[in-house]
Amino acid sequence: APFDDDDKIVGGYNCEENSVPYQVSLNSGYHFCGGSLINEQWVVSAGHCYKSRIQVRLGEHNIEVLEGNEQFINAAKIIRHPQYDRKTLNNDIMLIKLSSRAVINARVSTISLPTAPPATGTKCLISGWGNTASSGADYPDELQCLDAPVLSQAKCEASYPGKITSNMFCVGFLEGGKDSCQGDSGGPVVCNGQLQGVVSWGDGCAQKNKPGVYTKVYNYVKWIKNTIAANS
């Protein structure tokens, strides 16, 4: 594989322990998706990460070892966006209400929703426990991080003709080598301290001219706030 020498996320690095305190792991007997804690009782993830039963794991770094900072809380409500489209992955966003409030501390804390859409060129942090190999399987135990820029909508649409909606944007590198991958879905893209993206899809991982595609959280702030208010 062209980019699998010490690849992390693909091409990232080991996050400093608990340096991404809003990152959660969604577990159904194994880690299947990421998510972001947006308040004490609600998590944002991807619509395609829907399962009828989910355990939300907060304060994780090594997901295979109990390190003492974890909080495991079952999902009480799982609300996929009403216009989620499985075929196109448009509206690929979901809210999870925790069955009890998370305890906020230095290792578990919330991330702010965006106040403006993501600007081209902005450097963002993507994180997750997804596959670190661009071909084959190498799933890490420890949380991986990747710094990557927001790409212009024109470059995004040119990479995926006819597939990019106004609810999606691209982050990454057209030269390949650095990207989110399988297992990172639902996880955060944080730019300037705001949750701008949710890991959604892409053609393969870290392939040339095939950057990662992310749900544009800014378009859903009203839906998120209304849904939380209606289910509190």
Epitope: G29, F32, H48, Y50, K87, A137, Q182, G183, W201
Partner: antibody
């Protein structure tokens, strides 16, 4: 409860086709995929292919490409497997099994948690 | 394609014995392995998923371990209803492949 119920046993002549059905109940059909697995008499398990119940995306075993077609009918929560140009070595018990979807950048886990009871297909002249 | 090699192909054991079955993948599959039990004339039944997670309703005497290429299914204390054939399956990528099976027989 979650279950998959398959159609009854079939006896076919070489060169004919067979279509096996698998009716799902107890869960949301379109949230999962269906795999088809067969087992020849006294032999092990052989994966035939996979179909997404929501998008009808398919992935077939290479040795069966061109002879097998998997479909779904979401209105009746039923999956179908058609095998054409039957040969004697297609004699087997055919199983459908529920698996996870492969979508976006979700963890790919292709295990099968619920199985149908099996359909015996005998190919004989 | 990823080849799955199971060993032994058969094992004779007595009630109460500890039985270990191994499965080796021809390339790394991380934790994406499942174990099934099959009794004559019946459909396979999922025992273990994601290498070590016990399927709901399966007795705790069954356990799984391993990651990468080498995996193990252990029955800590064999019971009469455990005499069956056991299969591993790589769940990492298409085409899905199974091991050849291990038949656990009464000694």
């Amino acid at each position: 409860q979650v279950q998959l119920v398959q159609s009854g046993a079939e006896v076919k002549k070489p060169g004919a086709s067979v279509k096996v059905s698998c009716k799902a109940s107890g869960y949301t059909f379109t949230d999962y995929a269906i795999s088809w697995v067969r087992q020849a008499p006294g032999q092990g398990l052989e994966w035939m292919g996979w179909i997404s119940a929501s998008t009808a995306d398919t992935n077939y075993a290479q040795k069966l490409q061109g002879r097998v077609t998997m479909t779904t009918d979401t209105s009746t929560s039923t999956a179908y497997m058609e095998l054409r140009s039957l040969r004697s070595d297609d004699t087997a018990v055919y199983y459908c099994a529920r698996g996870t979807e492969v979508v976006g950048k979700m963890t790919v886990y292709l295990g099968m948690d619920v199985w149908g009871q099996g359909t015996t297909v005998t190919v004989s002249s | 394609d990823i080849q799955m090699t199971q060993s032994p192909s058969s094992v004779s054991a007595s009630v109460g014995d500890r039985v270990t079955i191994t499965c080796r993948a021809s390339q790394g599959i991380s934790r994406w392995l499942a174990w099934y039990q099959q009794k004559p004339g019946k459909a396979p039944k999922l025992l273990i998923y994601a290498a070590s997670s016990l399927q709901s309703g399966v007795p705790s005497r069954f356990s799984g371990s391993g990651s990468g290429t080498d995996f193990t299914l252990t029955i800590s204390s064999l019971q009469p209803e455990d005499f069956a054939t056991y299969y591993c399956q790589q769940a990492n990528s298409f085409p899905i492949t199974f091991g050849g099976g291990t038949k656990v027989e009464i000694k």
